[in-house]
């Protein structure tokens, strides 16, 4: 028999939401417009291009990649479309609000739509730690505060730090990671007798996980250079992401093969790792000045990634009840500071060379940017695992963790869908 | 000869509205972000705003803002002010400059204006 | 970041040291430059990231400073040096010009 969304949620998901949606529509009603300027379409094209592979990454990268377990890839796929469309109309009202909001409308370009999709990312990072544990209303309340919070502290890092657009976003590993990470910490953690299978992966989900991660392979590119302010920046971002996720893809396989006591490749591990240069060279990625380092940082976060597989899902799943197939989290807090790390290493070498104590400086406030970024993720994710923890929520039964038939209908019932 | 040439200044009434262009000649617009900056009569330089090189952001000073836009079409070389409900305080020469930038450090990179036009005068009197 | 420059104007001799002053309200790390403007002519970059000469400009421009105070040194003053001298910073928006620093013949 089928299992239903429990009465009070059927009543409490569709009302929050669409009353949600319908104050959205109003905020945008009274307080956007778009940007009146006659511009070049071909400018406008090729403008738009960056903001679909985004979107592209958002919805089919990240929406496949966290669709590997066996009896919850719908909700996977759904959920995460479901987050992006939400995240990125309340991100461009909050980047508005933030940004430009003392001087009247928000003016809404491509641009900002561009910075909310990157926002709205961060959550589907963020919930790969909690996905088949909660229900819609519960990542509704998530979107919320993770928007809000990235938006905040990039508008904190921008004013304190005077940090541009790209060196403020690529936080966005570290702040996804940690607050992903701290949500968890806070739901239910044991999975009961009779469902471990349900966070086990299988074999068609897999494939369409590692279709995601084809997807955010070919378009990280295009994350890592989207707001970057000139062309030869951009070039260089696009240039040294290419070689490091390329390398790491290389290393991912061959390490995970090495990995094994027979040699055999791990599927979760592929998924993640391909993906590990990409991170790792987010934060300088138009600093570097040569492929050959970036493809040993793609090297160095390959060999990071396979090994974080190996070791920490066992760890990760005892403190924080995250399934060994959700990686995303971990894996990106440490590729992240990694990154990170990268970029503080550049400073100091110039520091050195310089012999100037105002890039000195520099790094003391880039290690208080980190600081800051990783303090506010782990703050307002406990936040937001404190509040998905009301009852008033109806979060699913940890009986029911990992189930699509919770909440989708299916015309045959038959188990092993 | 690397060039930016300025037109559609003259006299406006407060109010009104004008629109300057800005043609770039010898190197691709696109490749560059631009900036407009104007003078007013016996004062100093002060930036108006900023456009990125392929038009996805804009920057403008707080005088301006709401009343100024900017705009670049890349397929005809050409960078745009438009100048909305003008005041007695926007007459000015207003310049066109290109940003230029380079990585001098291993960390950053730097911005400045490293070509600017001949100017084009805006006067706004009743 | 607001600039002020000292000292607002000054006179000097041809084959003259003159150096032009630029503080920043706060601190700019090496996003300065400076720009010669002529009467009746646009300005002209002379100095990048503070200490960097643009390709073309006589090497007797120099810059120097970070942080807060920035130095422009004209080592020996050229009768086309005469002019107007502005620095800007780069480093964050709206990038601030300073009010400008006349040299002209004593």
């Known amino acids: 028999m089928s299992s239903k969304y429990p009465r009070s949620v059927r009543r409490c998901l569709p009302l929050w939401a669409l009353t949600l949606e319908a104050a959205l529509i109003l905020l945008f009603y009274f307080f956007t417009h778009y940007d009146a300027s006659l511009e070049d379409q071909k400018g406008l094209v090729a403008s738009y291009q960056v903001g679909q592979d985004l979107t592209v990454m958002a919805a089919i990268g990240l929406g496949f990649l966290t669709s590997s377990f066996r009896r919850h890839s719908w909700s996977s796929v759904a959920f995460n479309l479901f987050m992006l469309a939400l995240g990125v109309q309340w991100a461009i009202l909050l980047d508005g609000f933030l940004s430009q909001f003392p001087s009247g409308k928000v003016v809404i370009t491509l641009f900002s739509i561009r910075l909310a999709t990157m926002s709205a990312l961060s959550v589907l990072i963020s919930v790969d730690a909690v996905l088949g544990k909660v229900n819609l209303a519960q990542l509704v309340v998530m979107v919320l505060v993770e928007v809000t919070a990235l938006g905040n502290l990039r508008m904190v890092i921008s004013n304190i730090f005077n940090t541009d657009y790209h060196m403020n976003m690529m936080h966005i590993y570290v702040f996804a990671a940690y607050f992903g990470l701290s949500v968890a910490w806070c739901l239910p953690k044991p999975l009961p007798e009779g469902t471990e299978d349900k966070d086990q992966t299988a074999t068609i989900p897999s494939l369409s996980a590692m279709l995601g991660a084809l997807f955010l392979w070919m378009f990280w590119p295009s994350f890592n250079s989207a707001l970057l302010r000139s062309p030869i920046e951009r070039k260089n971002a696009v240039f040294n992401t290419y070689y490091a996720v390329a390398v790491s893809v290389v290393t991912a396989i061959s390490g995970s093969s090495l990995a094994h006591p027979q040699g055999k490749i791990s599927k979760t591990y592929v998924h993640s790792a391909v993906l590990a240069g990409g991170v790792a060279v987010g934060t300088s990625c138009h600093l570097i000045p040569s492929p050959w380092l970036a493809m040993v940082l793609g090297l160095v976060a390959g060999l990071i990634s396979v090994g974080g597989a190996k070791y920490l899902p066992g760890c990760c799943n005892r403190v924080l009840g995250i399934p060994h197939s959700s990686i995303m989290g971990y894996n990106f807090s440490l590729l992240g500071l990694l990154g990170e790390i990268i970029y503080i290493v550049l400073l100091v070498l110039d520091t050195v060379g310089a012999g100037n104590g105002m890039i000195g400086f520099q790094v003391l406030l880039s290690i208080g940017e980190l600081s800051l970024a990783i303090v506010i993720a782990l703050m307002s994710g406990l936040l937001t695992g404190l509040l998905l923890n009301l009852k008033i929520w109806k979060a699913p039964h940890e009986a029911k963790y990992f189930d699509d038939q919770v909440f989708w209908k299916f015309p045959h019932l038959a188990v092993g869908f | 000869e690397v060039q930016l040439l300025e037109s559609g200044g003259g006299v406006v009434q407060p109010g009104r509205s004008l629109r300057l262009s800005c043609e770039a000649s010898?190197?691709?617009?696109?490749?560059?972000?631009m900036h407009w900056v104007r003078q007013a009569p016996g004062k100093g330089l002060e930036w108006v705003a900023f456009?990125?090189?392929?038009?996805?952001?804009?920057y403008y000073e707080d005088s301006v803002k709401g009343r100024f836009t900017v705009s670049r079409d890349n397929s005809k070389n050409t960078l745009y002010l438009q100048m909305n409900s003008l005041r007695a305080e926007d007459t000015a020469v207003y310049y066109c400059?290109?940003?230029?930038?380079?990585?001098?450090?291993?960390?950053?990179?730097?911005?400045?204006?490293?070509?600017w036009g001949q100017g084009t005068t805006v006067t706004v009197s009743s | 970041a607001e600039l002020t420059q000292s000292p607002s104007s000054l006179s000097a001799s041809v084959g003259d040291r003159v150096t032009i002053t630029c503080r920043a309200s706060?601190?700019?790390?090496?996003?300065l430059n400076w720009y010669q403007q002529k009467p009746g002519k646009s300005p002209k970059l002379l100095i990048y990231?503070?200490?960097s000469l643009q390709s073309g400009v006589p090497s007797r421009f120099s810059g120097s400073g970070s942080g807060t105070d920035f130095t422009l040194t004209i080592s020996s003053l050229q009768p086309e040096d005469f002019a107007t001298y502005y620095c800007?910073?780069?480093?964050?928006?709206?990038?601030?010009f300073g009010p400008g620093t006349k040299v002209d013949i004593k």
């Open positions: 400059a290109r940003e230029g930038s380079k990585k001098v450090a291993l960390s950053r990179y730097y911005y400045y204006m490293d070509v």
């Open positions: 010898k190197f691709t617009l696109y490749n560059y972000g």
């Open positions: 456009i990125w090189f392929d038009g996805s952001n804009k």
């Open positions: 706060q601190s700019i790390s090496s996003y």
């Open positions: 990231a503070a200490s």
């Open positions: 800007q910073q780069s480093y964050s928006t709206p990038p601030a």
